[in-house]
């Protein structure tokens, strides 16, 4: 009976025309959904003048419906048993599941200045910036809709900038209209045991963005794992998101909608500083705002981010050390609702449910040249938005499951 | 490759004049902005004169403004640096750089320098 299941499973499980899993990797069957909360600055003209606290308040959920566009360029190589695609971007609000519009105004860190500030470094320029910055009217902070801030706006200053600069920014430009990837996986025909695992990504077995083996990317994109899952295992994971690959482990045994499930979940040795966690040391690439790499809870992203200064958390510095949120007040961390955590349907390593859960923040210093910056005293690692991803395996598909899966090992 | 390469330094009396050129070579002169800096032992590089691409903004440090004059010109991939009333000072390491601005990146380049001496 059991080698029968197994026999089938590793048959259904391959990404190849035909399988159970193929249809629902296309094309995910699961509504996913994006939410986001935007950390309101309360105090902004403080902050600016007297390099106070920042006081922060969250405003949301903002929802968007997200991954609902099949994979493209879905291209088999019967050669080395993989598939390669891409992964098209879309996001649709969902109004009815959001506290307001997208044109609801947030006072947010000015995105442009303090990008600008931290990569922009020489002295003429930073001259050159500074009268942009006043002339243009642009300060330490600024008002936006959750729509600019999110997709995209031309920022005054930038456009006056006399060279070929960039001059749209958003937390998430450009988004519409664009595509993660190329993945090429492992398709299991071989091998069931690689099934889903990327072999590269961008053409490339390593990131570029980190040292050692920090660089590399590890296991599937946390959609399936390879079957026949182990409470014992760590699974690995790569996501594009925070440019890394990272692993969650077995933390409860859980029912949903019937179906047994191991949800694992990201630890807080993950986000561990190399002190305590001495595997973490290639993620720490600088020394003065990691204070000699002791701080911990914050990845810097720059490299992967055009050399932004985009630092990445979990929501309201979950895990996070004390000097990084100590100069931010309003944030209340707690697990339940701040960490990430993945459903796993044992059997066929299927993610019937997941929430995933990060924080975007952008790290703004004292600058001699630049006015709205002359009075800080500190660096501000300064939370802009958190978001969690979720998505649920749907009412029929879980009858199903349960009917051809868990009902027939039972 | 980008070179940038000064010349002109030399040793002068109070009051005289000098005249710095630095040529570059390898990118697009026209499209960075040109600078000379200056260093003296133990201290920073401080931004003495600056221009932008052609028909930009230029700026002078306030010690050495209505005496010295920076210039150039792309058709000979040239910067320069003209200083009158010289004053013991001006005694540096004369440094000249290019930058310019491209998506969300900075190319900043710099020539070896040339000594200016101003001693009576």
């Known amino acids: 009976g059991d080698l029968l299941i197994q026999k089938t499973i590793k048959k259904q499980v391959v990404l190849e025309e035909g399988t159970i899993a193929f249809k629902n990797w296309v094309k995910t069957g699961t509504e996913v959904y994006r939410q986001f909360w935007i950390f309101d600055v309360q105090n902004p003209q403080e902050v600016m003048m007297n390099s106070s606290n920042i006081q922060v308040k969250q405003r949301g959920p903002y929802t968007y419906r997200v991954r609902f566009l099949a994979k493209e360029n879905v291209t088999q190589d019967a050669e080395d048993n993989t598939v390669s695609f891409l992964q098209p971007n879309g996001a649709i609000f969902e109004p009815s599941l959001s506290v307001g519009t997208e044109a609801d105004n947030f006072t947010v860190l000015n995105l442009a200045v303090a990008a600008a500030s931290h990569i922009y470094q020489n002295q003429f320029v930073q001259m050159i910036l500074n009268s942009l910055i006043n002339k243009s009217k642009s300060s330490m902070f600024q008002v936006r809709t959750l729509r600019e801030l999110l997709w995209g706006y031309r920022d005054p200053f930038l456009s006056l900038v006399p060279y070929p600069v960039t001059t749209t920014v958003g937390l998430f430009y450009p988004y519409n209209n664009t595509a993660d990837g190329v993945y090429k996986v492992f398709n299991g025909k071989d091998n069931i045991s690689k099934v889903a695992i990327i072999d590269t990504y961008k053409g490339k077995r390593n990131l570029s963005y980190w040292e050692s083996h920090c660089d590399m990317i590890n296991g599937t994109d946390a959609a399936s794992f390879p079957p026949f899952v182990e409470k014992s295992q760590v699974l690995q994971f790569f996501s594009s998101d925070i440019c890394r690959s990272i692993y969650a482990v077995f933390e409860s045994d859980v029912n949903l909608k019937g179906i047994p499930v191991y949800r694992f979940v990201l630890p807080s040795k993950a986000f561990a500083s190399p002190v305590e966690n001495p595997d973490n040391y290639c993620f720490c690439t600088e020394k003065i705002i990691s204070k000699n790499c002791t701080s911990y809870g914050v990845l810097d992203i720059s490299k992967c981010k055009e050399g932004r200064p985009v630092y990445i958390s979990l929501p309201h510095f979950l895990y996070a050390s004390p000097d990084v949120s100590e100069p931010i007040d309003g944030l209340n961390p707690n697990e339940e609702e701040h960490r990430t955590y993945l459903d796993i349907e044992p059997i066929t390593g299927f993610t019937l449910q997941f929430a995933k859960r990060l924080q975007v923040n952008l790290l703004v210093k004292p600058s001699e040249k630049i006015q709205v910056l002359k009075n800080l005293k500190r660096n501000y690692i300064v939370p802009i938005l958190w978001l969690n991803e979720t998505g649920t395996i749907g009412d029929e598909k879980a009858n199903m499951f349960r009917s051809q899966v868990t009902g027939k090992i039972n | 490759q980008v070179q940038l390469q000064e010349s002109g330094g030399g040793l002068v009396q109070p009051g005289e004049s000098l005249r710095l050129s630095c040529a570059a070579s390898?990118?697009?002169?026209?499209?960075?902005?040109m600078s000379w800096y200056r260093q003296t032992p133990g201290k920073e590089r401080e931004l003495v004169a600056a221009?932008?691409?052609?028909?930009?903004?230029?700026y002078y440090a306030d010690s050495v403004k209505g005496r010295f004059t920076i210039s150039r010109d792309d058709a000979k991939n040239t910067v320069y640096l003209q200083m009158n009333s010289l004053k013991p000072e001006d005694t540096a390491v004369y440094y000249c750089?290019?930058?310019?601005?491209?998506?969300?990146?900075?190319?900043?380049?710099w020539g070896q320098g040339t000594q200016v001496t101003v001693s009576s």
């Open positions: 750089n290019a930058v310019t601005l491209q998506g969300w990146s900075e190319y900043d380049y």
């Open positions: 390898g990118f697009t002169f026209s499209n960075y902005a």
């Open positions: 221009m932008q691409s052609t028909g930009g903004t230029t």
